[in-house]
């Protein structure tokens, strides 16, 4: 008789999840000399230990503590780039501007980027069929708790001027319910962080509006100002040109507004 299995609303664990995490860990530690001491088998064991045999709606930050310890990594606190709903451009930017870091440029973020995972209560199986959806099932699921934990820590690490890339094509340019809006904004430390600078990325070629005047950006400014952190905002009218100018700042066309 086939064993009854809980059916969740979200997609199941990414196929070949253990192999992917282990391979990513090996690759990352080869590329980043300061992380060469990391034992990737221990990292996988700690990752697995955070969710295997546990109810996937009952995961806590403490479950990830062993993994977080193994993934300790110093990032230059004044070179942090946060993002919301515009991950690809943020990653393209840090690939060019190598001294800046998104969360996914750290070991822990790199391991989990774009992956889904969950287990089942009282069995050592990984659930490849379905995993809890944050809205439809539960918020304390393995993926959401992981990102909440590492995002909080990443924001706490920041100092001086922190940059955030926001998607100007969305109806809510700043969304209070995003990881940036619900976790990172509230964990920036006012004693360390002087300014949050938002880069609002425009989608349309002919879009010349000042999206820094958008009501949701004003809401972000209000939240940040109340936390005793200065706020500034820049429109990035042409993201393609923006990236090109990061690559070649000497280019004569890069002196004009981008």
């Amino acid at each position: 008789v086939p064993r009854w299995r809980q059916q969740w609303s979200g997609p199941g664990t990414t196929k070949r999840f253990p192999e992917t995490v282990l391979a990513r860990c090996v690759k990352y530690t080869e590329i980043h000399p300061e992380m060469r001491h990391v034992d990737c088998q221990s990292v996988w064991d700690a990752f697995k230990g955070a969710f295997i045999s546990k109810h996937p709606c009952n995961i806590t930050e403490e479950d990830y503590q062993p993994l977080m310890k193994l993934g300790t990594q110093t990032v230059p606190c004044n070179k942090i780039l946060l993002w919301s709903r515009i991950k690809d451009l943020a990653h393209q930017f840090t690939q060019v501007q190598r001294d800046m870091f998104t969360l996914e440029d750290t070991l822990l973020g790199y391991l989990a980027d774009d992956l889904t995972w969950c287990g089942e209560f009282n069995t050592s199986k990984i659930n490849y069929q379905s995993c809890p959806d944050w809205r439809k099932d539960c918020s304390n699921n393995p993926v959401s708790v992981f990102w909440k934990t590492v995002s909080r820590r990443f924001a706490e690490a920041a100092c001086d001027v922190v940059h955030v890339m926001l998607n100007g094509s969305r109806s809510k340019i700043f969304d209070k319910n995003s990881t940036f809006g619900s976790v990172e904004v509230h964990n920036l430390q006012p004693e360390k962080v002087q300014t949050l600078e938002a880069w609002v990325i425009h989608g349309g070629r002919e879009d010349s509006r000042d999206l820094c005047q958008d009501p949701t950006i004003k809401e972000l400014e209000s939240i940040i100002s109340k936390r005793n952190i200065q706020f500034s905002c820049k429109n990035i009218y042409r993201p393609d040109k923006f990236l090109q100018c990061v690559k070649n700042p000497e280019d004569s066309s890069c002196t004009s507004e981008i």
Partner: nanobody, 124 residues
Framework: QLQLQESGPGLVKPSETLSLTCTVS??????????WGWIRQPPGKRLEWIGS???????NYNPSLNSRVTISVDTSRNQFSLKVSSVTAADTAVYYC????????????????RGQGTLVTVSS
């Protein structure tokens, strides 16, 4: 609960070396669970990170102070110390020792634990 306490002279003469010690209680200073550092706040200004020291013994200093700063650990006394050479009036500040949990991504500036601070005045 981890506690930190700064100690050292409150008055230092210009061109001399400022020396402060931080005594850690509640856990071993050599535990890999923490990293340690110093920050300061000059009168009327923002906090400024001075430097940090890690479990491995490696150090990281603020580039603007780099050549004048040394941070070291004395495990037998459960203490770490700060030395700033060739001080001027601009080094007058409240100095804090601080600790950070080695837990996921961390900045150079430890901010999970902090001492109460000690005022150091540079004056002849």
């Amino acid at each position: 609960q981890l506690q930190l306490q700064e100690s050292g002279p409150g008055l230092v003469k210009p061109s001399e070396t400022l020396s402060l010690t931080c005594t850690v209680s509640g856990d071993s200073i050599s535990s890999s669970s923490y990293y340690w550092g110093w920050i300061r706040q000059p009168p009327g200004k923002r906090l400024e990170w001075i430097g940090s020291i890690y479990y491995s013994g490696s150090t990281n200093y603020n580039p603007s102070l780099n050549s004048r700063v040394t941070i070291s650990v004395d495990t037998s006394r459960n203490q770490f110390s700060l030395k700033v050479s060739s001080v001027t009036a601009a080094d007058t500040a409240v100095y804090y020792c601080a600790g950070g949990d080695t837990y996921g991504p961390v900045g150079q500036w430890p901010s999970d634990y902090r001492g109460q601070g000690t005022l150091v005045t540079v004056s002849s």
